[in-house]
């Protein structure tokens, strides 16, 4: 009769994929069809793989996802012409561990971070065989890096300065497939090297060829000599210039620039070590030509006494204001009303106090340091009768 061999009475498995093996001897050797595995719920499984030697048949079963409810008595069954044999064995399915809390950052420098991995409490089953700390820079398409950890407190070295990182912990329990899901993520940012950038940076156009950069006075915390480094580059062209400004100054005039061009400027405070760059500031030099007409002009929401006019303007022409000029159709040119909008970021205005049942001619133009744009076309506006008032 066949005999089932090498099958322990108790097996502990981790949830996930599981490939149990049933091994049997006897003559004739059991075939693939003669070996089955019965789950605790009575489900009969057939081998996914099968091989034999001169003395043994080996049936390999596949359970794609074994879960704790599958725990219990499983039965390996062999049924040949020589007879039938069954061997029960106990399977205990364990839940993979996962930390409940994100790791805590105790301290950071410009290239290191001290972390409490907070591996306990965790969800799932122990015992924990090993722990991994996973980390990677945010905003980089890099794979997660990891280090094996034995203590709760660990130092991460060789980090990039002023970089945001993500951290999480992965716990591993004994047995095959014991790697749990990573726990909650913590973000932190490494410190910068050197002094912080100047505060209160402001960049304004001064003329067609100059921009003025100003900042608050710098009071160094040490006796070291320091200076302000200003970098300016053109958006349209690729030229770049770095200027060194004595540390006691609070402004610099950037000159020899081109009219109607956008520049990006940043600054830092350097000692022997280079400081941290400021955020980019952008500004346009003043225009050398008249501004173009406002575009996308739209008159809508017309009532008996009002109408909404909206528009867009092009960047880079140093437009300081928008004027809406309107007059009753057929009246003299000098009988117009001008509405001057001094905030060029405003792109909509409600004309109010119009007369009912009146035809108006509306012009809109932009002003800059050179002059006013030239409207090629007027817009018509006919107010509604009062009976149409909402």
């Amino acid at each position: 009769t066949p005999k089932i061999v090498d099958l322990p009475d108790h097996i502990e498995v981790n949830s996930g994929k599981f490939n149990p093996i049933c091994k049997a001897s006897g003559w004739p050797l059991p075939t693939n069809e003669e070996m089955t595995l019965v789950k605790p719920d009575g489900t009969v499984l057939h081998p996914k793989d099968f091989n034999h030697t001169d003395h043994f048949s080996v049936a390999i079963f596949t359970i794609h996802r074994i879960l704790p409810p599958d725990s219990g008595v499983w039965v390996c069954s062999v049924n040949t012409v020589a007879g039938m044999v069954e061997k029960p064995f106990n399977i205990s399915v364990k839940v993979l561990p996962k930390p409940l809390n994100a790791p805590n950052v105790i301290d950071t420098g410009h290239n290191f971070a001290v972390i409490n991995i907070s591996s306990e409490p965790y969800f799932g089953d122990g015992p924990i065989k090993s722990k991994k700390l996973l980390y990677k820079p945010v905003n980089h398409y890099e794979a997660w890096q990891h280090i094996q950890v034995t203590n709760e407190i660990v130092t991460l070295n060789y980090l990039e300065p002023r970089t945001e990182y993500e951290l999480c912990v992965q716990l591993v329990r004994r047995g095959e497939g014991g790697e749990g899901h990573p726990g909650p993520v913590r973000r932190f940012t490494t410190a910068s090297i050197g002094l912080p950038p100047p505060r209160g940076l402001n960049l304004l156009p001064k003329s067609q060829t100059t921009l003025n950069l100003t900042w608050q006075p710098i009071f160094p915390s040490s006796e070291d000599d320091f200076y302000v480094e200003v970098e300016r580059r053109s958006v349209q062209k690729s030229d770049q210039q770095n200027i060194k400004v004595p540390g006691n100054l609070t402004s610099v005039l950037l000159n020899n620039l081109h009219p109607r061009e956008q520049y990006v400027v940043r600054a830092r405070v350097n000692t022997k070590a280079q400081g941290e760059w400021s955020e980019d500031l952008t500004a346009w030099t003043l225009s050398d030509i008249l501004p173009p007409q406002p575009e996308n002009i739209k008159i809508s929401n017309i009532t008996h006494s009002s109408a909404v006019i909206s528009w867009t303007i092009l960047d880079g022409y140093s437009i300081s204001s928008i004027t809406i000029r309107y007059k009753v159709q057929g009246k003299n040119e000098d009988q117009h009303v001008d509405v001057k909008i001094k905030n060029a970021t405003i792109t909509q205005y409600q004309l109010k106090g119009l007369e009912p049942e009146t035809a108006y001619q509306v012009d809109i133009f932009a002003e800059n340091n050179i002059g006013s744009s030239n409207p090629a076309f007027s817009h018509e506006l006919v107010t509604l009768p009062e009976s149409q008032a909402p």
């Epitope: 575009e295 996308n296 002009i297 008159i299 009912p356 018509e380 006919v382 009768p385 149409q388």
Partner: antibody, heavy 115, light 107 residues
């Protein structure tokens, strides 16, 4: 000078949707509404709807809400009207007209729906 | 929808004669009315907008006026090119609506 160019004629099979065009020149296309108007043979004019090219805001005559779709292509300063599932009732001349107050008109496209 | 009733639907007149075409609005439309001219080849041109404002390039013989809910287009002295179709159009309330048209024929 302001010009609205429309193809002279279009022939379409019943049920096959058709897209009529109106190419604008001589003014700032995105600063004026564009209207579409229908005229059946020997009949009067009927307003279909209008679109503002700056943001594609559209106002449609309810009668044409399931028939006409108005769009624009700012890069080519062209307004379009697509007519879905045309029937012989849609055979007509279709005009585009500039502005809220219809100050300039295209020459019209004669649409024939025939198998 | 606002109804625009245009009359007469056709009119025979002689060169040099003075004629008036009328549109009546079913609701108050204020001055929100245009007069359009359509030639036999289909070409449409705006003559008058906002009831009485003459478009540039339009001869002075064309005038627009209003009396209550009646709107008139008057041609003071007919010339040969005036014998075409005319439509009124209101744009006070959507949907914009046209009059039925007047065919001006030479007598």
């Amino acid at each position: 000078q302001v010009q609205l160019q429309q193809p002279g004629a279009e022939l379409v099979r019943p049920g096959a949707s058709v897209k009529l065009s109106c190419k604008a020149s001589g003014y700032s296309f995105t600063s004026y509404w564009m209207n579409w108007v229908k005229q059946r043979p020997g009949q009067g004019l009927e307003w279909i709807g209008m679109i503002h090219p700056s943001d594609s805001e559209t106002r449609l005559n309810q009668k044409f809400k399931d028939k006409a779709t108005l769009t624009v292509d700012k890069s080519s300063s062209t307004a379009y009207m697509q007519l879905s599932s045309p029937t012989s009732e849609d055979s007509a001349v279709y005009y585009c007209a500039r502005g809220y107050y219809f100050d300039y008109w295209g020459q019209g496209t004669t649409l024939t729906v025939s198998s | 929808d606002i109804q625009m009733t245009q009359s007469p639907s056709s009119l025979s007149a002689s060169l040099g004669e003075r004629v008036s075409l009328t549109c009546r609005a079913s609701q108050d439309i204020g001055i929100s009315l245009n007069w359009l001219q359509q030639e036999p080849d289909g070409t449409i041109k705006r003559l008058i907008y906002a009831t009485s404002s003459l478009d540039s390039g339009v001869p002075k013989r064309f005038t627009g006026s209003r009396s209550g809910s009646d709107y008139s287009l008057t041609i003071s002295s007919l010339e040969s090119e005036d014998f075409v179709d005319y439509y009124c159009l209101q744009y006070v309330s959507s949907p914009w609506t046209f009059g039925g048209g007047t065919k001006l024929e030479i007598k």
